[in-house]
Interface confidence: medium
């Protein structure tokens, strides 16, 4: 069949599966006179043969891992054995079959992880190699955790990136790992080829021992410090410690205090630098920060709480220079005149601020001394002996001693004797009608004016009117302010009105005097008034708890992982349905009921971080009102990129035969983040068998030199495997291949007869 299995001599490429016994010829070349026979040269490896008549075949199974491409040349000879046609290049590409199992580089791995480490952040890599072609499923590896020991409550604390072999904590592992409970774990990890997708895949396993170390970067317990300490300062009160030595510590005062009496040294010990005053400030909250050698924060700040303990260093103080009370003529014995409330700046509800009251003097002592008594602990003044007469003594002055356990203070009280309170307040109308308001009426709004009058002595407690809402407002949404000159009452909104809980309120006001009524006079219906408040509904949209929700996850987090959640409430109490808007990359889904957000696709930091979407909360039923908030997902980089060659190095060659050892320079890179100093790669030969012919030496963090050790190379392509290690934590290694050809040169360029592909650069060394 001309063309497929036979034809004239020309450059050709054939693809043959490895591992298959020969079953047919490769090609039959036809001779054109004067050619009569054919000759085969190149990388035959004694496998490829051409018969004199032009029949090209192979005599045993090929092995791609030994040689992936055989570069052959076929020439046509005349009867005298002189080349009359060719040689032309014949390329045999060996196609891969899955004839190599993956193998882990180590049979046992050891690593450590700090408790509370970020979920998804790799702390250890397992690495397997497979000699099969990585461009086909045969060489595509899939890592899996087979078992975790111990397994507590069937919860996996560890996860593995099935492509990179990066081991990290799950969210549960980050929260629950505790070296005090379980200091070590063992994982059995499997690796499969065929991308893990085939029943016929080969596999290998390895064991990983993991030590859990304590995370010591945590907030200390709250500290108590006695005020006015006379001990020498500074005094150590607590400490923080970063997980590794060399951190720089500092304190941050978020409150921006005029004096900040705390310091931290470079061990992480925290000191109070001067005596504290509880009455100036009873508690301090500040932050300890750990920074690296450049001054950049290493982690989140820790909150430090200091409570200042009270001592009795303050005397009682009077409420005003003179406290004025009123008492009616003819008031009965035991009636309350008023309460003297002194203050003490020391801590409330302690012995240091517990006060005693005692009358030390009364003037005038008419008609006798001891007309008044004061309750020892409450400070309430009472009429002790008899009723008073305004025309005899219109005013009394009392000196009262107020004491705590260490200090005494004198306070002064003036008691004015006033006419009897025998008139009740009378409302100008008993019913103020209906008032309709929307539930979103502003707090502080005056919604109604009420008025009562009292015929007692003006500008005394007998005629002053206090308005109280005694019915219809158990929530305290309304209040009444009184004008002291006119006794007008202004009804104001104190708390938001709410249609859902109180659509109609029947409000009852009572007008009363601060002074008690005389015996026999009682408040009656004239002192009461009512009105009806009708609240109308305003449908309000759901309200998110935050304007922006932010979450942080590792970019290699497993699909289906919860990456964050949002919350909103509906003022009307309707159920809420959550949805996402603007998920342009299709990475996320939201639980419509709970607001939890999950990943549904692989995340990629390099595509942009943070990833911003909008979350929508919509009422279920009602008017279907909705609100929008932002969700920002910060994607953390993982060291998931092994080093690789910085560019395509096909076409490297040395002119054969070598006159002296030669060398060439190549550059490595990787796609991970690097701090100030850039990559710091180390280079070595990929296998021991290469060391007789080659050596590799580092030039700097990114470049290395590949040199020949001798000059005795065959005229063919050599594939030099080079191991590049990124020196990361943990280190990640890439094995790259540099194809180097030793070839005959013409004018310093590699001589590639007919069939040389144009466009591939060639570099001579």
């Amino acid at each position: 069949q001309e063309g497929k299995f036979s034809g004239p001599l020309k450059p050709m490429t054939f693809s043959i599966y490895e591992g298959q016994e020969p079953s047919q010829i490769i090609f039959q070349f036809k001779a054109n006179p004067p050619a009569v026979t054919f000759e085969l040269t190149g990388e035959t490896d004694n496998i490829f043969v051409i018969e004199r008549e032009g029949l090209l075949y192979y005599n045993r199974a090929l092995d791609r891992e030994t040689r992936s491409t055989h570069n052959l040349q076929v020439a046509a000879l005349d009867a005298n054995g002189i080349i009359v046609e060719g040689p032309v290049p014949i390329t045999i590409k060996v196609k891969d079959i899955n004839d190599n199992r993956p193998t882990f580089l180590q049979s046992k791995y050891e690593g450590s992880v700090r408790q509370n480490s970020r979920p998804g952040k790799p702390f250890l890599y397992v690495n397997a190699t497979d000699l099969d072609d990585p461009a086909t499923p045969n060489g595509q590896l899939y890592y899996q955790i087979v078992i975790q020991l111990p397994m507590i409550n069937n919860v996996m604390y560890f996860q593995i990136n099935n492509k990179t072999g990066a081991i990290s904590l799950t969210r549960e592992g980050s929260q629950e790992l505790n070296p005090a409970k379980n200091p070590s774990y063992n994982l059995v990890i499997s690796v499969k080829d065929m991308g893990g997708q085939s029943e016929n895949s080969f596999s290998d396993t390895t064991s990983v021992d993991i030590i859990v170390t304590e995370n010591i970067w945590k907030a200390p317990k709250p500290v108590e410090m006695v005020e006015n300490s006379t001990d020498p300062h500074p005094i150590k009160i607590t400490q923080v410690r970063w997980n590794d030595p060399g951190a720089q510590y500092s304190l941050v005062d978020k409150e921006k205090l005029p004096r900040f009496p705390f310091s931290i040294d470079q061990e992480g010990d925290i000191y109070v630098t001067q005596p504290l005053d509880r009455e100036e400030k009873d508690a301090y909250v500040f932050y300890a920060v750990a920074k690296d050698e450049y001054g950049k924060p290493l982690s989140y700040p820790l909150e430090i709480h200091v409570k200042v303990k009270d001592i009795n260093d303050n005397p009682p103080t009077c409420p005003s220079p003179v406290t004025v009370f009123e008492v009616q003529e003819n008031e009965r014995l035991g009636n309350s005149i008023g309460t003297l409330t002194a203050h003490d700046r020391d801590e409330e509800n302690t012995a240091n601020s517990f006060l005693n009251y005692r009358i030390v003097e009364q003037t005038p002592k008419l008609p006798m001394d001891g007309l008044f008594l004061i309750q020892t602990y409450a400070g309430m003044l009472q009429l002790a002996k008899q009723s008073l007469k305004k025309q005899d003594t219109p005013q009394y002055n009392l000196t009262i001693e107020v004491s705590d356990k260490d200090f005494k203070t004198l306070c002064f009280v003036q008691i004015n004797v006033i006419d009897i309170n025998d008139q009740i307040p009378i409302f100008e109308k008993s019913d103020y009608g209906n008032l309709t308001l929307a539930e979103d009426t502003n707090i502080g709004s005056t919604i109604l004016t009420i008025q009562a009058t009292d015929a007692d002595e003006p500008f005394t407690g007998s005629s002053k009117i206090l308005y109280h809402i005694i019915k219809g407002d158990s929530e305290g949404r309304l209040g009444v302010d009184t004008d002291p000159h006119t006794n007008t009452g202004y009804v104001i909104i104190k708390k938001p009105l709410d249609f859902e809980t109180a659509a109609v309120s029947n409000i009852v006001f009572k007008a009363e005097n601060p002074e008690p009524l005389v015996f026999g006079v009682k408040y009656n219906a004239s002192s009461f008034a009512k009105f009806t408040l009708i609240v109308t509904d305003v449908n309000e949209a759901p309200q998110f708890s935050q304007h922006v929700f932010q979450a942080k996850v590792s970019e290699d987090v497993a699909i289906g992982t919860k990456v964050g959640n949002v919350t909103a409430k509906d003022p009307e109490g309707l159920d809420i349905s959550y949805s996402l808007r603007g998920d342009t990359r299709g990475w996320l889904k939201i639980d419509h009921v709970t607001g939890e957000i999950f990943s549904v696709a692989p995340l990629d930091r390099e595509a942009g971080s943070p990833y911003r979407v909008q979350v929508v909360a919509t009422e279920v039923g009602g008017s279907s009102l909705s609100s929008v908030s932002e969700f920002h997902l910060i994607l953390m980089d993982v060291n998931d990129n092994p080093p690789r060659l910085a560019k395509d190095y096909t076409g490297l060659f040395f002119c054969h035969p070598l006159s002296a050892p030669g060398s060439l320079i190549f550059e490595a890179t990787d796609d991970d983040q690097h701090l100030f100093r850039g990559p710091h790669f180390t280079f070595s030969l990929g296998s021991g068998s290469l060391q007789n012919d080659w050596e590799v030496s580092k030039i700097n963090g990114t470049h290395a030199r590949l040199s020949t050790r001798h000059t005795e190379f065959e005229e063919r392509e050599y594939v030099v495997l080079i191991r590049i290690n990124d020196g990361g934590r943990p280190p990640l290694e890439g094995i790259v291949s540099l194809p180097v050809t030793f070839c005959s040169c013409v004018e310093g360029s590699c001589f590639r007869p007919a069939g040389h592909q144009t466009g591939i650069p060639t570099v001579g060394m």
């Epitope: 290493l298 942009g608 971080s609 983040q673 690097h674």
Partner: nanobody
Framework: EVQLLESGGGLVQPGGSLRLSCAAS????????MHWVRQAPGKGLEWVSA????????YYADSVKGRFTISRDNSKNTLYLQMNSLRAEDTAVYYC????????????WGQGTLVTVSS
Amino acid sequence: EVQLLESGGGLVQPGGSLRLSCAASGFTFSDYWMHWVRQAPGKGLEWVSAIWSSGGSTYYADSVKGRFTISRDNSKNTLYLQMNSLRAEDTAVYYCAKSPTLYDDFDYWGQGTLVTVSS
């Protein structure tokens, strides 16, 4: 290709002011924390300041707090550092850098601009 290009450096007297700019391209500027880092002659690198994408969060090293102000204009893809009350010890090459979060390593940074404070 990510590029960060600093400008605005120069010679200034002690007590004077300078404003540095950093023009960013090749990435979504508003998605990243941006930093200023400096290196004084013969000394190591020192982190100076950082700002979140919205400009709502800013951080400063103690040595510049109260004197330097970091800001950004996302519409112009530009980062700024306003330096007031300059001192001789502020003499350094100032670099701008980016990172996805405050605590992450810098993934790119610029070539730097020299600030010299001298009378």
